[in-house]
């Protein structure tokens, strides 16, 4: 005569997060007298998953009708599966005892594996802006996926990057995993419109990878080039001097005019023009009343861009009795002078 057997036909079950897991169990006999219970794990620390007699198990339902007589199907369904539910589940027959029931026989166990999608990758750049030719680091993080196998790629404007390091944690077994990757990107002056993309591919995504993006406009600072130019005389005693501020990003910029070192006017860039590459140009002009000056005038255009140390460009107006041909200062340095005689 055969003793009761507890049969768990499935060695493993794979379920997507959010779905319902069915854990099958049947007994070959109704005796010995006593209940069946479900546990996750074995040994003294095991977790009770379902006990029909007592307890509250809102996510668990029985496959068979609980009003069915002489039931030998002890299969259960667990709803709204999360990676935390992963583990080995045991269907255990107890023998009625006094005062407590005694474990009689356990099924072989069913390993529940949970397929969980990675969270949307979050890409973050450096805390401070950097200028072209500098290398900056971007990080990409995604969490909560299972199984552990995952692929991460970096792109800049559609071109795959190769200089990055990726870690998947934890190294050992876990209910779910996280990925962390750091990519190094060399900035160029044309990167205002550039994007860095982190792409994550996982078995749960069915070939449709998740992407996280960062705009280099949040990271790059393109310092301006300055050009101070003297415009033709407007009136007998007035000179118009312009300061061309070119190819800068971001827009935050303050310009100060100095006459012989004294502040003449300060203004903030407002009506800028945008270049194709996303950088900005701006022009400021200063009307100088030459008759008010007895000596040469040194005009300085001083620009403070995005909170950085100021850069400046100077232009000398020489007050003289003899007229000379007018020109413009086209020097590329931050400071310098170009003498002009004004009548």
């Amino acid at each position: 005569e055969e003793e009761l057997q507890v049969i768990q036909p499935d060695k493993s079950v794979l379920v997507a997060a959010g779905e319902t897991a069915t854990l099958r169990c049947t007994a070959t006999s109704l005796i010995p007298v006593g209940p069946i219970q479900w546990f996750r794990g074995a040994g003294p620390g095991r977790e009770l998953i379902y006990n029909q007699k007592e307890g509250h198990f809102p996510r668990v339902t029985t496959v068979s009708d609980l009003t069915k007589r002489n039931n030998m199907d002890f299969s259960i369904r667990i709803g709204n599966i999360t990676p935390a539910d992963a583990g080995t589940y045991y269907c255990v027959k107890f023998r009625k005892g006094s005062p407590d029931d005694v474990e009689f026989k356990s099924g072989a166990g069913t390993e529940l594996s949970v397929r969980a999608k990675p969270s949307a990758p979050v890409v973050s750049g450096p805390a401070a802006r950097a200028t072209p030719q500098h290398t900056v680091s971007f990080t990409c993080e995604s969490h909560g996926f299972s199984p552990r196998d995952i692929t991460l790629k970096w792109f800049k404007n559609g071109n795959e990057l190769s200089d990055f390091q990726t870690n998947v944690d934890p190294v050992g077994e876990s209910v779910s995993y996280s990925i962390h990757s750091t990519a190094k990107v060399v900035l160029t002056r044309e990167d205002v419109h550039s994007q860095v993309i982190c792409e994550v591919a996982h078995v749960t995504l069915q070939g449709d990878p998740l992407r996280g993006t960062a705009n280099l406009s949040e990271t790059i600072r393109v310092p301006p080039t300055l050009e101070v130019t003297q415009q033709p005389v407007r009136a007998e005693n007035q000179v118009n001097v312009t300061c061309q501020v070119r190819k800068f990003y971001p827009q935050r910029l303050q310009l100060t005019w100095l006459e012989n070192g004294n502040v003449s006017r300060t203004e903030t860039a407002s009506t800028v023009t945008e270049n194709k590459d996303g950088t900005y140009n701006w022009m400021s002009w200063l009307l100088v009343n030459v008759s008010a000056h007895r000596d040469d005038v040194k005009l300085t255009c001083q620009v403070e861009h995005d909170g950085q140390p100021a850069v400046s460009k100077s232009h000398d107006l020489k007050v003289s009795a003899h007229p000379k041909e007018q020109g413009s200062n086209t020097a590329a340095e931050n400071t310098g002078s170009n003498e002009r005689n004004i009548y």
Epitope: E1, T28, P32, G34
Partner: antibody
Framework: EVQLVESGGGVVQPGGSLRLSCAAS????????VSWVRQAPGKGLEWVST??????YYADSVKGRFTISRDNSKNTLYLQMNSLRAEDTAVYYC???????????????WGQGTLVTVSS | EIVLTQSPATLSVSPGERVTLSCRAS??????IAWYQQKPGQAPRLLIY???SRDTGIPARFSGSGSGTDFTLTISSLQSEDFGVYYC??????????FGGGTKVEIK
């Protein structure tokens, strides 16, 4: 059709012994628990004993005096009654246990009963 | 031990009447209650299990309800063959299985 037929009842003196039998048919006897329930004349029902596989359960009033057993090869349930007392006088019913859900037993089929009289 | 108290002890009813029998448990037995009918000289017969599930072949006029400690067996329209003694039994916590003292339903 499920059938339970008791036998072995009779008159016995106090302190005496009696062995009741219950022949079962019409179901897979070996996988079910089976029980004895008694009813004293003019009284209500009183559970006596249940046997599962080799697991046995007794009412306090008969513990140590009665022994339940089964022979699955013969589809037969037994109740060995020793040290009988006058208060053991009753009709003894053999009953097939039924479970509902995952545990909990009640009695879905009963025999016609056999009368045991303990009297001097 | 769980004690089951049935009331009334006796009920005199005319055929066609609605009958309500009560069974009260001394502690929570969830829905683990069965009801039996016993006619004179016969073995008990299972009517209801799990408080409200009718056994196979039991007429629809028999219905059970309740959970916890208070249970009811209702016969919607009493037939002549329904006379006898009705017992409730708990199987929530055993040993021992316990029965109520019975309610005798007799002809008025």
């Amino acid at each position: 059709e499920v059938q339970l037929v008791e036998s072995g009842g009779g008159v016995v003196q106090p302190g005496g012994s009696l062995r009741l039998s219950c022949a079962a048919s019409g179901f897979s006897f070996s996988i079910y628990a089976v029980s004895w329930v008694r009813q004293a004349p003019g009284k209500g029902l009183e559970w006596v004993s249940t046997i599962g596989a080799d697991d046995t359960y007794y009412a306090d009033s008969v513990k140590g005096r009665f022994t339940i057993s089964r022979d699955n090869s013969k589809n037969t349930l037994y109740l060995q009654m020793n040290s009988l007392r006058a208060e053991d006088t009753a009709v003894y019913y053999c009953a097939k246990d039924s479970t509902v859900g995952w545990s909990g037993d009640f009695f879905d089929y009963w025999g016609q009963g056999t009368l045991v009289t303990v009297s001097s | 031990e769980i004690v089951l108290t049935q009331s009334p002890a006796t009920l005199s009813v005319s055929p066609g009447e609605r009958v309500t029998l009560s069974c009260r448990a001394s502690q929570n037995v969830r829905s683990d209650i069965a009801w039996y009918q016993q006619k004179p000289g016969q073995a008990p017969r299972l009517l209801i299990y799990a408080a409200s599930s009718r056994d196979t072949g039991i007429p629809a006029r028999f219905s059970g309800s309740g959970s916890g400690t208070d249970f009811t067996l209702t016969i919607s329209s009493l037939q002549s063959e329904d006379f006898g003694v009705y017992y409730c039994q708990q199987y929530y916590d055993w040993p021992p299985f316990t029965f109520g003292g019975g309610t005798k339903v007799e002809i008025k």
